[in-house]
């Protein structure tokens, strides 16, 4: 498979409201006119496929409406934003490139971003 | 339904250039590659290029560099295709065609055709 | 480029017979990903191509089962199981695996 370097930042903490970005870049060895990004979490050696998109340059980066990404691309780059995450979803989130069209097929796995994501303190109650 | 028009057919001079066009319908214009294929006289099909109707990209067969030019407008879901410096080995049927990725980039639809004649 | 070579030239076949097209590439389409970069196209006379084919064995929306493909990396069969007199025209296989795409120089399907 033709590989292709693919960067991304080695960790982020989520914000307090469970939301975590980061952006995934990729070095293109040729023209690539539609990639497809996969977010991959690993965690206890198990992976998963927590979402995906496929997009035409110079297209918006869509997710399947039941997402929990978004994301927008500018040339190599993808900024991935992950909502509704909590303490237990903490772990490795591995970006994954794939420049699908035109031919040859390139494949590109970052090293992963480690996302901490601790939940809020809940409030406590006042007495008055 | 998905449809590609192609204009009318053409008869040019020798050293002439003509600009054929490909008008989509029936689905989301800026979702597909465009390619453009040619056929020579009962012969077989070359792949001449392809366009991204998103930003006007495109990928190219070299033997066709500097004889076909591509372009869209978006605005009114048509590719076109401008060939220069005609000659009689130019003659030929032109076609249009569709990408689809759920068929890994095949051709889904193609337009009926453009029969260019150089002629003098 | 790839070169796509396809045997027969014409193929005469008699209705409700089968019928097989070869097609062999000058380089191995099966891509380490898995997927075969083989494709079969249909043009039937006076027409344009139509899709029958993609990834060397999945028939395309439409396409009557009757039609298979199978092959290696480098060597590839279409196969109609009971020809019916729709089927004729000229078939093309094509690679998407690099650029530029090429095609088979086409079969000639007829009615005896």
């Known amino acids: 498979c033709k590989a292709m370097h693919v960067a991304q930042p080695a960790v982020v903490l989520a914000s307090s409201r469970g939301i975590a970005s980061f952006v995934c870049e990729y070095a293109s060895p040729g023209k690539a006119t539609e990639v497809r990004v996969t977010v991959l979490r690993q965690a206890d050696s198990q992976v998963t496929e927590v979402c995906a998109a496929t997009y035409m340059m110079g297209n918006e980066l869509t997710f399947l409406d039941d997402s929990i990404c978004t994301g927008t691309s500018s040339g190599n780059q993808v900024n991935l934003t992950i909502q509704g995450l909590r303490a237990m979803d903490t772990g490795l989130y591995i970006c994954k490139v794939e420049l699908m069209y035109p031919p040859p097929y390139y494949l590109g796995i970052g090293n992963g971003t480690q996302i901490y994501v601790i939940d809020p303190e809940p409030c406590p109650d006042s007495d008055f | 339904q998905v449809q590609l028009v192609q204009s009318g057919a053409e008869v040019v001079k020798p050293g002439a250039s003509v600009k054929i066009s490909c008008k989509a319908s029936?689905?989301?214009?800026?979702?597909?590659?465009i390619n453009w294929v040619k056929q020579n006289p009962g012969q077989g099909l070359e792949w001449i290029g392809d366009?991204?109707?998103?930003?006007?990209?495109?990928n190219s067969n070299q033997k066709f560099e500097g004889k076909a030019t591509l372009t869209v407008d978006k605005s009114i879901s048509t590719a076109y295709m401008e060939l220069r410096r005609l000659r009689s080995d130019d003659t030929a049927v032109y076609y249009c065609a569709r990408l689809r990725r759920e068929y890994f980039y095949a051709m889904d639809y193609w337009g009926q055709g453009t029969l260019v004649t150089v002629s003098s | 480029d790839i070169v796509m070579t396809q045997s027969p030239l014409s193929l005469p076949v008699t209705p409700g017979e089968p019928a097989s097209i070869s097609c062999r590439s000058s380089?191995?389409?099966?891509?380490?990903?898995?997927?075969?970069?083989l494709y079969w196209y249909l043009q039937k006379p006076g027409q344009s191509p139509q899709l029958l084919i993609y990834q060397m064995s999945n028939l395309a929306s439409g396409v009557p089962d009757r039609f298979s493909s199978s092959g290696s990396g480098t060597d590839f069969t279409l196969k109609i199981s009971r020809v019916e007199a729709e089927d004729v025209g000229v078939y093309y296989c094509?690679?998407?695996?690099?650029?530029?795409?090429?095609f088979g120089g086409g079969t000639k399907l007829e009615i005896k």
């Open positions: 029936g689905y989301k214009f800026t979702d597909h590659f």
């Open positions: 380089k191995s389409l099966l891509h380490s990903n898995g997927i075969t970069y």
């Open positions: 094509a690679q998407n695996l690099e650029l530029p795409l090429t």
């Open positions: 366009i991204n109707p998103n930003n006007g990209g495109t």
